[in-house]
Interface confidence: low
């Protein structure tokens, strides 16, 4: 029944696999979190030799921008006081590309560049063409209306005789390829003779014009090739460390990234904050649950309830303000002094007045809440949609008789959502080698250290089987009940005969991951050797001569 | 206005259980986490645990591992923290708090539930 | 977890500092948030992600990090600044917060 020579010398090498297979196992359960750690950070770096430098370069997503126009319904009832009624039109969509140029290495560990956008119609995902009319509130003249208010009436006088004969009225009735892009308007001229520079348009004004086939300043960012812990975070823009639209510093701070990849190794206590050239303002959003998109685990980030909150309400954003009602934002001083406001869309999570004020808006948070969601390991945006709304403040004004007996009110003119999620090639390579390639290390590293202990019990296994053969049945009771620790035995282990030692101390603990709850390999090892002890000799029949015994 | 209305003081003997309670009023429930604290006398503050109420996911603090229970009933928009076995060092002032500012900054407290474990 | 001195003083007017000593896991990686407790009431966020302060908090209050060392400042003191206060921040080891013992102030 014993084992032969040349079975102990198998039973030993395979012993001596096991203990490799096992060792190798516990070095990749400490070694391969901190080798998967080495590469993401040698990996996201701004730097041509990192594997997501094209991806930063030329992003190979695509994003789509998604308009919504709000239809003016009664624009002559509103000039009569009555409150607005608007129809939602849309979704016109555009495919959006991005590229960056003008890329220079500083020696600061960072880098500059610029990154131009162009956009192109997509009649296939959109709800209308592009030649839809649509009325709007014509900005340009209730706009003008607003910031005239407090000039004197003479001003305003020549202003209205202006508009007059330029024939401008409060609204107007114009494509939606128009209002994007631009049209012609004589009161543009008008404003950049009268008024050189105030204006960001020369011959036409529409409200996405600026954004087509242009840049959205410099941005100067972190490599994160000297110092990972800034990766990413904005250094600059147009040169400026700050910016000097708002009334306090801290709402004038540039913190954050520009809103494309953010550091790796997030935590749900991260925070994502970008700085947004359109908004004229750092954003923060914030961590509200995690997800899985197309198989990669990810971290959804939304807007806080205090994004657009009013300095009552969140003190913090006093410096955004003057301030109307809580959940929108004044942009005018980045805006060409134009009485425009940023919000959600449909005025969700704003002031309730605000959506009440006009007839035909529906805020839902499903519809019009904006998120990103993240992978949290490399700060890679997998999957997002930044939902956002422009309206125009306008009110009757003394002595601009264009603006009627309109009451105040922030009317919505668009809103618009910004989407991209990864797909295609870049997704499968993005799973294979973030996903699924440490999955199978982390799979293998627990399979080598099982394989291990199993083939380490073989010598065991052999050796108490030799003895079984012996026929020393009070030795062999004597030996099971050593081999079981805590039962009777006092300072002899489990492994046996001199040839064996225990394995080493890395290969004795085995940790959950995340836990923080350990357990000794030791017993769990001990315990599958009694067992094996107590059953062996019960299957070979010699069951009675064990009857004392039990496993633990 | 986000708050968090504590349950009163309890007194317990030593080995017994006592459940407090913490409602929040003033936002929905589920949009926040609940973390339960500890104020011992002469220790300082200790995180115990807390809970997600959208999904009654919890995380303990090792050192109340297994004899802290949080639960959270989203019908009433209350959390609950139970302690078991309770010892003289129990004897402590334990707030429920949530971090609308991000890591570890608890913005909104409860008023605290003086706990007393005595013979 | 995180280390602070047990007391501080300063007459009305003067500046006073509170130190908070922590570690890699905590300070380290992560933003530091203050607390002033009033006796008898419960802990009320002072500064939060390192130098914001809390709504409500008075610009008198100011705070920093340098690698795992973190600082508030309160210039101008006042009486009604005497409190108990003490510094948070979350652990990676403990994946959770961890607090300082507090330093009390006190107003001369």
């Known amino acids: 029944m014993g084992c032969s020579a040349k079975a102990r010398w198998a039973a030993g090498a395979l012993g001596v696999a096991g203990l490799l297979c096992a060792v190798l196992g516990a070095v990749m359960i400490v070694m391969v979190p901190s080798l998967i750690k080495q590469q993401v950070l040698k990996n996201v770096r701004i730097d041509p030799s990192s594997l997501s430098f094209n991806m930063w370069k030329e992003i190979p997503i695509p994003f789509y921008l998604s308009v919504y126009f709000f239809d003016v319904m009664n624009p002559s009832e509103i000039l009569k006081g009555e409150k607005p009624q608007v129809r939602e039109r849309g979704p016109y969509v555009y495919r959006e590309f991005r590229h960056k140029s003008n890329i220079t290495f500083n020696n600061n560990d960072t880098v500059s560049f610029l990154e131009y956008r162009t956009f192109q119609f997509q009649p296939s995902k959109s709800h209308g063409s592009e030649s839809d009319y649509i009325v709007m509130p014509n900005i340009l003249v209730l706009g003008a209306a607003v910031m005239m208010e407090n000039k004197p009436m003479t001003l305003k006088l020549i202003m209205t005789l202006a508009f007059t004969t330029l024939g401008e009225r409060a609204f107007m009735n114009r494509t939606v390829g128009e209002i994007m892009w631009g049209y012609k308007d004589p009161l543009v001229n008008l404003i950049n003779k009268y008024f050189p520079g105030m204006f960001p348009f020369k011959d036409k004004f529409g409200l996405f014009a600026e954004l087509n086939n242009s840049d959205s300043g410099l941005f100067t960012v972190f490599t994160g090739v000297q110092n990972i812990s800034r990766i990413h975070l904005v250094d600059k823009w147009n040169g400026l460390s700050k910016v000097d639209f708002w009334h306090s510093d801290q709402c004038n701070m540039i913190n954050g990234t520009s809103g494309q990849m953010w550091p790796p190794f997030m935590t749900p206590e991260s925070s994502l904050e970008f700085y947004s050239p359109e908004a004229c303002r750092s954003m923060k959003l914030m961590y509200k649950e995690s997800g899985v998109f197309e198989g990669i685990p990810t971290y959804r980030f939304v807007a806080p309830k205090t994004l657009f909150a009013n300095g009552s309400i969140y003190p913090p954003n006093e410096g955004f303000c003057p301030c109307l009602e809580s959940g929108i934002q004044n942009v005018s001083t980045c805006r060409f002094s134009a009485p425009l406001f940023l919000s959600h869309p449909h005025f969700l999570n704003a002031d309730p007045v605000l959506a009440e004020a006009v007839t035909g808006l529906h805020p839902n948070q499903e519809a019009h809440s904006l998120f990103l969601d993240i992978h949290p390991v490399t700060g890679i945006p997998m999957n997002c949609s930044v939902k956002l709304q422009l309206s125009l403040y306008m009110k009757s004004v003394a002595g601009i008789g264009q603006t009627g007996k309109i009451e105040p009110v922030v009317l919505p003119l668009l809103w618009f959502a910004e989407s991209g999620a990864m797909e295609g090639e870049t997704l499968h390579t993005f799973y294979t080698q973030l996903v699924l390639m440490p999955k199978v290390m982390h799979y293998a590293q627990y399979v080598l250290l099982a394989l291990g202990c199993v083939l380490l019990l073989v010598p065991v296994i052999c050796q108490i089987r030799s003895q079984v053969g012996a026929g020393q049945r009070a030795a062999r009771a004597d030996s099971h009940s050593l081999a079981c620790w805590g039962k009777g035995a006092s300072d002899r282990t489990l492994w046996p005969t001199a040839a064996w030692s225990p394995p080493p101390a890395a290969v004795l603990r085995l940790c959950r991951s995340g836990s923080g709850h350990c357990w000794g390999l030791r017993s769990t090892l001990a315990s599958f050797a009694c067992r094996v002890a107590t059953t062996l000799p019960v299957l070979e029949g010699l069951g009675p001569s064990l009857g004392g015994g039990t496993g633990s | 206005e986000v708050q968090l209305v504590q349950s009163g003081a309890e007194v317990r003997k030593p080995g017994a259980t006592v459940k407090i309670s913490c409602k929040l009023t003033?936002?929905?429930?589920?949009?926040?986490?609940i973390f339960w604290l500890q104020l011992a006398p002469g220790k300082g503050l200790q995180w115990m645990g807390l809970?997600?109420?959208?999904?009654?996911?919890?995380i303990y603090a090792e050192k109340f591992q297994g004899r802290v229970a949080i639960t959270a009933d989203t019908s009433t928009d209350t959390a609950y923290m139970e302690v078991s076995s309770l010892r003289s060092e129990d004897t402590a002032v334990y707030y429920c708090a949530t971090d609308s500012v991000g890591a570890a900054g608890f913005d909104v407290w409860g008023r605290g539930t003086m706990v007393t474990v005595s013979s | 977890v995180l280390t602070q001195p047990p007391s501080a003083s300063g007459a009305p007017g003067q500046r006073v500092t509170f130190s908070c000593s922590g570690s890699?896991?905590?300070?380290?990686?992560?933003?530091v948030n203050w607390y002033q407790q009033l006796p008898g009431a419960a802990p009320r966020l002072l500064m939060h992600t390192t130098d914001q302060r809390a709504s409500g908090a008075p610009d008198r209050f100011s705070g920093s990090k340098s690698g795992t060392s973190a600082s508030l400042a309160i210039t101008g003191l006042q009486s009604e600044d005497e409190a108990d206060y003490f510094c948070a921040a979350w652990d990676d080891s403990l994946d959770g917060p961890v607090f300082g013992g507090g330093t009390k102030l006190t107003v001369l």
């Open positions: 809970i997600d109420p959208k999904d009654a996911q919890t």
């Open positions: 890699g896991s905590n300070i380290g990686s992560y933003t």
């Open positions: 003033g936002d929905t429930f589920t949009d926040y986490f």
